[in-house]
């Protein structure tokens, strides 16, 4: 599966369109800031099967697709720019779907691993309650979407592991 | 490795304009932000103010304000700092350091090497 | 403005001695509090962010705690490179403020 080429542009893209989402200055967020308890252990890529490693990221990625296609989120965003940021979600999970398939009888590994996938939701769920907690408000938007940027940052490390695997 | 490297010693006259300057290099530029650090002689740390590299947008200490500005070029990975009339008073080391803007990461866990800046008649 | 107040403002400590340094903020600041080294003449080194967390490559001898308005530093046992000015900073709100700093000298 030639996951990164067609995978690595849709990911800079999609950093792009969240650098250009914000609406407020994110210098009067500064005391809003939170430790959300990013799972950098489930995107180091060591301890993983190719599979697994693909469907953390596909995790991610539909979790993401998921906070920001809520009511919440579509008041706070340019909508514009919302859908150009779906647009590339959509496109990275297709990827994704079409290199976990590939990927069916490859290898002896499950496809998944179920405790990753749980602590990246878990991670997700951390946040949307942090947002509950802030009532949405747009400092709290704002620190979520650093966040997220953070967390695409550091997936595009674990893609550029795999695809050195291949 | 990420580094952050400043302009050179620089020695001026009062009313001189003078720019300075903070290579980032060994990471996503655009991904943290610039601050800026002022140490007098013999004196404590002084924030003096930050800029988010990715827009451009700035924040001042009120004690510098409308002293110096701040700015940064994204496509070659470098914050300025700069004044537009030197005084005797702003003769001092300069440190520019990044900082994680919202995230939840290490404050000014890089540093540049400090620019040494005399301002004398 | 947050004001930070750092005392002492200088100490005489030999090696091995156990070293603490306390910061008080003017107001509340949470845990955003962070300690920096700096020797004469090199810019300032993070030991500590968010009050407790060591940074990485940072002797384990270096600690912090505290939350609110009162924050402390403390160096386990000192070692002949620890003699060094000693920062603290919140992290909390712009504008940025640092403490007036903590210079450890040999006893």
């Known amino acids: 599966c030639d996951l990164p080429q067609t995978h690595s542009l849709s990911n800079r893209r999609t950093l792009m369109i969240m650098a250009q989402m914000g609406r407020i200055s994110p210098f009067s967020c500064l005391k809003d800031r939170h430790d959300f308890g990013f799972p950098q252990e489930e995107f180091d890529g060591n301890q993983f099967q190719k599979a697994q490693a693909i469907s953390v990221l596909h995790e991610m990625i539909q979790q993401t697709f998921n906070l920001f296609s809520t009511k919440d989120s579509s008041a706070t965003w340019d909508e514009t720019l919302l859908d150009k940021f779906y647009t590339e979600l959509y496109q990275q999970l297709n990827d994704l779907e079409a290199c976990m398939m590939q990927e069916v009888g490859v290898e002896d590994t499950p496809l998944m691993n179920v405790d990753s996938i749980l602590t990246v939701r878990k991670y997700f769920q951390r946040i949307t309650l942090y947002l509950t907690e802030k009532k949405y408000s747009p400092c709290a938007w704002e620190v979520v979407r650093a966040e997220i940027m953070r967390s695409f940052s550091l997936s595009a490390n674990l893609q550029e592991r795999l695809r050195r695997k291949e | 490795e990420v580094q952050l490297v400043q302009s050179g010693a620089e020695v001026k006259k009062p009313g001189e304009s003078l720019k300075i300057s903070c290579k980032g290099s060994?990471?996503?530029?655009?991904?943290?932000?610039i601050g800026w650090v002022r140490q007098m002689p013999g004196k404590g740390l002084e924030w003096m103010g930050i800029?988010?590299?990715?827009?451009?947008?700035?924040a001042y200490s009120p004690s510098f304000q409308g002293q110096v500005t701040i700015s940064a070029d994204k496509s070659i990975s470098t914050a300025y700092l700069q004044w537009s009339s030197l005084k005797a008073s702003d003769t001092a080391m300069y440190y520019c350091?990044?900082?994680?803007?919202?995230?939840?990461?290490?404050?000014?866990?890089?540093w540049g090497q400090g620019t040494l800046v005399t301002v004398s008649s | 403005d947050i004001q930070m107040t750092q005392s002492p403002s200088s100490l005489s400590a030999s090696v091995g001695d156990r070293v603490t340094i306390t910061c008080r903020a003017s107001?509340?600041?949470?845990?955003?509090l962070n300690w920096y080294q700096q020797k004469p003449g090199k810019a300032p080194k993070l030991l500590i962010y968010?009050?407790?967390s060591l940074q990485s490559g940072v002797p384990s001898r270096f600690s912090g705690s505290g939350s609110g308005t009162d924050f402390t530093l403390t160096i386990s046992s000192l070692q002949p490179e620890d003699f060094a000015t000693y920062y603290c900073?919140?992290?909390?709100?712009?504008?940025?403020?640092f403490g007036q700093g903590t210079k450890v000298e040999i006893k």
């Open positions: 107001q509340s600041i949470d845990r955003a």
């Open positions: 350091a990044r900082h994680p803007g919202l995230n939840w990461a290490p404050d000014f866990d890089y």
């Open positions: 800029i988010d590299p990715s827009d451009s947008d700035t």
């Open positions: 968010f009050a407790s």
């Open positions: 060994g990471y996503s530029f655009t991904s943290y932000w």
């Open positions: 900073q919140q992290s909390f709100d712009f504008p940025l403020t």
